[in-house]
């Protein structure tokens, strides 16, 4: 998996008028890491290790271009013609990344009203857009008015690119990133589902990165793919992630099934509570 | 005592034939079973898999979409659909149980004495 | 599919002395790893499960170790009735048995 800094910035329009508040939301290797969701941005790092990544320094400076960013985008729905009546939306993602071989990719996308209409590679500077009349004539507009900013248009979007990568590299340095392995709590439950069968549920949270395998086995052999149910892996809000596998089983074969756990090289197996006892927790280190 | 007895082989023709398995001694509807081979002079080659329910079964590459398997829990009964044989398909054929013992990985811990099949074209 | 390799795949040893099988996996399998001993004419018998756990009623003389790739059942001190062919088998991925290894009087 790439290191990857991605960037979600969206300002909305009411009538025509782009309204003065803004949204940014920052995710460093797929994980809530930043957001700005008041009038005057506030950079607010998304839990705990969000904030080991930069230790006790300040959020200025990613206050002020998150800031500068907000502008510059409410500034480009404003150029939007044809705005209708109501509430409109212009967001702009903004994607770099860090191989394994250390090539980099980076990228840029604008959506209006949730659709996708313009495309840039910042390292090719070329630019790409859907095949809509729509979208071709939003596109258009956005072209239109980023050329005739020619100044913002080499200080700022070309140097996205760099700015982008400069920032994850910061953000790598610290180190929390690359080490981070927190495992998973597994915890399974049990419920009676219809006569003579129960549905047994396998969750794990908090653990980070977010590839895991969670399935169950009878007997030591996994059940197949099309007797089990999965959650999606989901950010759980603090920095890590949470998924689930539930099946259906004959009471009284319990112990025969077992819950196996598979994360960052290490796995465990955690069988169905028997009785009465309804939850089972266990943390392996 | 818990004992698996396999029946049907003998010579076959290439077109098709079914092996039984019968169990004993042990609650069979709660078991997982398999159906293992072994060609003369050659080493055991898994082909496939049921557990207790019917709803996961697994087959080797060798045999995919050729033999099928299933079970009858109420006649405690394992039995192996081959169609298609080929002259490869000669083999001691082995029922066998998967182990319920807590912590098992998947080990047969009770085998039939096994039935040769013998492909005659 | 995961493929085990067993070696060697023969061997000669005397009665007392300490044997040693391998049986390396194409991917890590952890710990989903099971021995047999077959001998000739006869079914195969659960040694050893979850790669070192002894079977009940198998002499204690066998043993088995190793996880991820690399397995090894050990016969610490090897008897007549124990000369045979033993197979390893893994269920991590569906199931599949090595190759054998062939153990005969020296």
């Known amino acids: 998996e790439p290191h990857s800094l991605r960037y979600n910035l969206t300002v909305l329009s009411w009538d025509g008028s782009v309204q003065s508040g803004f949204l940014t939301e920052v995710h460093l290797d797929g994980q809530p890491f930043l957001r700005c969701d008041r009038q005057k941005c506030r950079a607010k790092p998304q839990g705990q290790w969000a904030e080991d990544v930069l230790g006790n320094k300040t959020w200025d400076r990613e206050t002020r271009d998150l800031t500068g960013n907000g502008k510059d985008l409410r500034m480009t729905l404003a150029h939007i013609k044809d705005q209708k009546e109501g509430l409109h939306s212009l967001q702009e993602i903004r994607v770099c990344e860090i191989h394994e071989d250390n090539s980099t990719r980076s990228s840029q996308h604008f959506y209006y009203d949730g659709e996708l209409f313009l495309s840039q590679n910042l390292e090719t500077k070329e630019w790409t857009m859907p095949q809509s009349s729509r979208a071709q004539t939003l596109a258009m507009n956005v072209r239109n008015f980023l050329k005739e900013d020619a100044m913002k248009t080499k200080t700022h979007y070309h140097a996205m690119h760099a700015d982008c990568l400069q920032e994850l590299r910061r953000y790598l340095k610290s180190g929390v990133v690359l080490r981070r392995t927190v495992p998973p709590m597994v915890n399974v439950t049990r419920s009676e589902a219809s006569e003579g069968n129960i549905t047994v549920t396998c969750r794990a949270s908090g653990f980070y990165p977010w590839n895991i395998t969670l399935s169950w086995r009878q007997d030591g052999v996994s059940l197949s793919h099309d007797t089990q149910q999965w959650g999606d892996v989901l950010p759980d809000g603090n920095g890590t992630y949470q998924t689930w596998v539930a099946t259906r089983i004959c009471q009284g074969e319990e112990q025969r099934f077992t819950c196996y756990m598979e994360h960052s090289g290490n796995h465990s197996t955690h069988p169905v509570p028997s009785g009465k006892v309804l939850v089972l927790q266990s943390h392996w280190q | 005592e818990v004992q698996l007895v396999e029946t049907g082989g003998g010579l076959v023709q290439p077109g098709g034939s079914k092996l039984s398995c019968g169990a004993s001694?042990?609650?069979?509807?709660?078991?997982?079973m398999n159906w293992v081979r072994q060609a003369p002079g050659k080493g055991l080659e898994w082909i496939s898999y049921?557990?207790?329910?019917?709803?996961?079964?697994y087959y080797a590459d060798s045999v995919k979409g050729r033999f099928t398997i299933s079970r009858d829990n109420a006649k405690n009964s394992l039995y192996l659909q081959m169609n298609s044989l080929r002259d490869e398909d000669t083999a001691v054929y082995y029922c066998?149980?998967?182990?319920?013992?807590?912590?098992?990985?998947?080990?047969?811990?009770?085998w039939g004495q096994g039935t040769m099949v013998t492909v005659s074209s | 599919d995961i493929q085990l390799t067993q070696s060697p795949s023969s061997l000669s040893a005397s009665v007392g002395h300490r044997v040693t099988i391998t049986c390396r996996a194409s991917?890590?399998?952890?710990?989903?790893l099971n021995w047999y001993q077959q001998k000739p004419g006869k079914a195969p018998k659960l040694l050893i499960y979850?790669?070192?756990s002894l079977q009940s009623g198998v002499p204690s003389r066998f043993s088995g170790s190793g996880s991820g790739t690399d397995f090894t059942l050990t016969i610490s001190s090897l008897q007549p009735e124990d000369f045979a062919t033993y197979y390893c088998?893994?269920?991590?991925?569906?199931?599949?048995f090595g190759g054998g290894t062939k153990v005969d009087i020296k």
């Open positions: 066998a149980r998967v182990s319920s013992i807590t912590g098992n990985t998947g080990a047969f811990d009770v």
């Open positions: 001694g042990f609650t069979f509807s709660s078991y997982s």
């Open positions: 049921i557990n207790s329910r019917s709803n996961t079964i």
């Open positions: 991917q890590s399998i952890h710990n989903y």
């Open positions: 979850a790669a070192s």
């Open positions: 088998q893994q269920s991590y991925s569906t199931l599949t």
